[in-house]
Amino acid sequence: FGISGRHSITVTTVASAGNIGEDGILSCTFEPDIKLSDIVIQWLKEGVLGLVHEFKEGKDELSEQDEMFRGRTAVFADQVIVGNASLRLKNVQLTDAGTYKCYIITSKGKGNANLEYKTGAFSMPEVNV
């Protein structure tokens, strides 16, 4: 179906968990576009009024970023062109847990997907041989 004269595109996310104090990844992929300048990535968090992160015209656009994410977010800029909109979240905090939306605009259309992000003090399971 059409959205503002464009089609919807497929956006895929994967629920994940982050270790407090470490860096985490919020995974998101989309149907790639041939022109980086036509791609807009917005990450939003439920209940947070500023943006988590925005990437447009080939670079970060953080003027509307919420202060709780200041200096802690990055996309993999060199991988956006191949459809990777995943977000790196530095120094994960307990309050980072919640529902995130990965919203994508390309020349092909728009799409979004939600993901649940859990935070905690997780440890790698020990494997005894």
Epitope: G47, L49, G50, E64, Q65, E67, R70
Partner: antibody, heavy 116, light 107 residues
Framework: QVQLVQSGAEVKKPGASVKVSCKAS????????MYWVRQAPGQGLEWMGR????????VYAQKLQGRVTMTRDTSTSTVYMELSSLRSEDTAVYYC?????????WGQGTLVTVSS | DIQMTQSPSSLSASVGDRVTITCQAS??????INWYQQKPGKAPKLLIY???RLQSGVPSRFSGSGSGTDFTLTISSLQPEDFATYYC?????????FGQGTKLEIK
């Protein structure tokens, strides 16, 4: 157009409390934070804190912690700022302002005079 | 808290003059700075946000620049209605502190 309309001037005695309202119109009330800023006579602007109209979560300036309370009523698109244990140095014009990282627009201001 | 040091605190200028007001942050705030104009008895009005972006409806004679810790508001050619007090504000980290203000007066 986006508008913030504040309640009228107040005169209070030291030790009393005051509650100032700020009614928003012309936009989605829950889409942006509401901030409070005050200005003592002839002085500069002082950030007091903010409220998230969606969740009711607040952040207050440290020097006002324990005396200031910000609340909201989503049914009337109104935020409130209550300041207790008033002293003479709280005499100021109190402004509400909408925003995320910049404030626009601002309410017209509410003069609160604390005098015995 | 992040301190914002604004200078000068007052300034006398004439219509047509080019005027520059500076603001220095006590730490790196990237481009999270805003500029407001306030006239006596009125609420502040947003002029510039995100260091250099002109708010809708604000005349193009106003401009902002800078990044990191040092920022500038410039009025390219002063008009009679520009005589007012100007404030910078950082929005990098709460509390979103203001500079102490610059009063722009007619010479």
């Amino acid at each position: 157009q986006v508008q913030l309309v504040q309640s009228g001037a107040e005169v209070k005695k030291p030790g009393a409390s005051v509650k100032v309202s700020c009614k928003a119109s012309g936009y989605t009330f829950t889409a942006q934070y509401m901030y409070w800023v005050r200005q003592a006579p002839g002085q500069g602007l002082e950030w007091m804190g903010r409220i998230n109209p969606t969740s009711g979560n607040t952040v207050y300036a440290q020097k006002l912690q324990g005396r200031v309370t910000m609340t909201r009523d989503t049914s009337t698109s109104t935020v409130y700022m209550e300041l207790s244990s008033l002293r003479s140095e709280d005499t100021a014009v109190y402004y509400c302002a909408r925003g995320i990282n910049w404030f626009d627009p601002w309410g017209q201001g509410t003069l609160v005079t604390v005098s015995s | 808290d992040i301190q914002m040091t604004q200078s000068p605190s007052s300034l006398s200028a004439s219509v047509g003059d080019r005027v520059t007001i500076t603001c220095q942050a006590s730490q790196d705030i990237s481009n999270y700075i805003n500029w407001y104009q306030q006239k006596p008895g009125k609420a502040p009005k947003l002029l510039i946000y995100a260091a250099s972006r002109l708010q809708s409806g604000v005349p193009s004679r106003f401009s902002g620049s800078g990044s990191g810790t040092d920022f500038t508001l410039t009025i390219s050619s002063l008009q009679p209605e520009d005589f007012a007090t100007y404030y910078c504000q950082q929005s990098y980290r709460s509390p979103f502190t203001f500079g102490q203000g610059t009063k722009l007066e007619i010479k």
